[in-house]
């Protein structure tokens, strides 16, 4: 029977700016049950406040509701790791919410073939962008990544869309079903997880872009 | 012709773990995203999560954090679903499901019980 | 996460009669939305995807519309093998949810 191995705080994100969650890993637990706490002051003050919320982001976390997230402030954080022979201590690690923002997916992808009479055809798609993002207070910009493939390719094609809501895609083969996704990140952050795949049948008579 | 086949059923006791394995032909798993989505007795379907074997990443709902865990190995086209700390509940059909939902496999009856 | 509400739980028709199943969802999900038939001891089966495209190998008599919030999933004339349990599924954001299904029985 030993005291616990020390832990490591490996993730903190945050979805808007509003509120964030951390993770840490245990160490080895020494043989015995072990308890841990999360503690942070914000850099300038020597107060300390413990985790207000263990339980929100699942095990091994600390979720900072709106009350305790503040954009303009560095936290600084550690968890400690107790059991009946002793503790142990992660290392420091200093959060700036502006820098870990992780969006939610995008939403709403729609993707259609568009057959115009006197062009080429096309598969045209948009998107909405996470709920949880206010892009009117101008504290964001979305950047955004689509990617496609037939159903049965191993290898993605992916395009840069910029800030825009909307692509187009020209080169795309005949009679195949295609999957979409979408994805997101702010421009000082972190690229969200892909959207569900939208899939759609590309007719057999499309014509290929020359 | 693309077939989803699962491993044969299990009963476990509570607390414990089970793997359940969904083994992919007809197609690579590489090229394959699964969902698993369970269905307890006489009760509706509930998607649990989704893995991509291409970049490893693994989404899933809420009330499963920190008791579900995906993978996949692609050089057997297999995907694999674990469920721990295992509760009555628990009892269900598990299906793994193509990305496009029109593969599913056969489903795995998971009994859970002292 | 998005809450999908099925009705009615029951529909009892007869054979050769139209089937008119509902399903809305509690937030837009456009037209990322599945409909899933099952029987009983087998795994469901995909009739719709894309609120309105009919998956390989399902009969015309399965057609779907609606876009947002609303879909309706309509069998034009019911067989004999068409009475099942019928899911719809969005698949527009995490996590993706079901519907809590409708029964349609012989009448």
């Known amino acids: 029977q030993l005291p616990p191995g020390k832990p490591e705080i490996f993730k903190c994100r945050s979805p808007n700016k509003e509120t964030f969650t951390c993770w840490w890993r245990p160490g080895t637990d020494g043989g015995l049950p072990t308890n841990y706490s999360l503690t942070y002051h914000r850099e300038g003050e020597t107060l300390m406040h413990e985790c207000p919320d263990y339980i929100t982001g699942g095990p091994n976390s600390c979720h900072f509701g709106k009350q305790y997230t503040s954009m303009w402030r560095t936290y600084v954080m550690m968890v400690n790791a107790t059991n009946q022979m002793g503790s142990s201590f992660s290392d420091e690690l200093y959060v700036d919410v502006t820098y870990i923002v992780q969006p939610d997916p995008p939403l709403e992808l729609t993707v259609e073939v568009k057959q115009p009479e006197d062009r080429k055809p096309y598969l045209w798609m948009k998107w909405s962008p996470p709920t949880l993002i206010d892009l009117k207070t101008g504290w964001f910009t979305l950047l955004y990544e689509i990617r496609l493939k037939p159903e049965k390719a191993a290898e993605w094609e992916t395009h840069f869309a910029g800030q825009q809501t909307e692509f187009k895609i020209l080169s795309l083969h005949p009679g195949q079903k295609y999957l979409v996704q979408v994805r997101c990140k702010p421009d000082h952050g972190y690229w969200s997880a892909w959207s569900p795949a939208t899939f759609i049948q590309i007719p057999s008579d499309f014509i290929m872009n020359d | 012709q693309v077939q989803l086949v699962q491993s044969g059923a299990e009963v476990q006791k509570p607390g414990a773990s089970v793997k359940v394995s969904c083994k992919v032909s007809?197609?690579?798993?590489?090229?394959?995203?699964i969902h698993w989505v369970r269905q307890a007795p006489g009760k509706g379907l509930e998607w649990m999560g989704n893995?991509?074997?291409?970049?490893?990443?693994?989404i899933h709902a809420q009330k499963f954090q920190g008791r579900v865990t995906m993978t996949g190995d692609t050089s057997t086209d297999t995907a694999y679903m674990e469920l721990s700390s295992l509760r009555s509940e628990d009892t269900a059909v598990y299906y793994c499901?193509?990305?496009?939902?029109?593969?599913w496999g056969q489903g795995t009856l998971v009994t859970v019980s002292s | 996460e998005i809450v999908m509400t099925q009705s009615p739980a029951t529909l009892s028709v007869s054979p050769g009669e139209r089937a008119t199943l509902s399903c809305r969802a509690s937030?837009?999900?456009?037209?990322?939305l599945a409909w899933y038939q099952q029987k009983p001891g087998q795994a469901p089966r995909l009739l719709l995807y894309?609120?309105?495209t009919r998956a390989t190998g399902i009969p015309a008599r399965f057609s779907g519309s609606g876009s947002g919030t609303e879909f309706t999933l309509t069998i034009s004339s019911l067989q004999s093998e068409d009475f099942a349990l019928y899911y719809c599924?969005?698949?527009?954001?995490?996590?993706?949810?079901f519907g809590g299904g409708t029964k349609v029985e012989i009448k």
């Open positions: 499901v193509g990305v496009t939902f029109d593969y």
């Open positions: 007809g197609y690579t798993l590489t090229a394959l995203s």
């Open positions: 893995f991509d074997p291409g970049d490893g990443e693994t």
């Open positions: 937030q837009s999900v456009a037209s990322n």
């Open positions: 894309g609120a309105s």
């Open positions: 599924q969005h698949y527009n954001n995490w996590p993706l949810t």
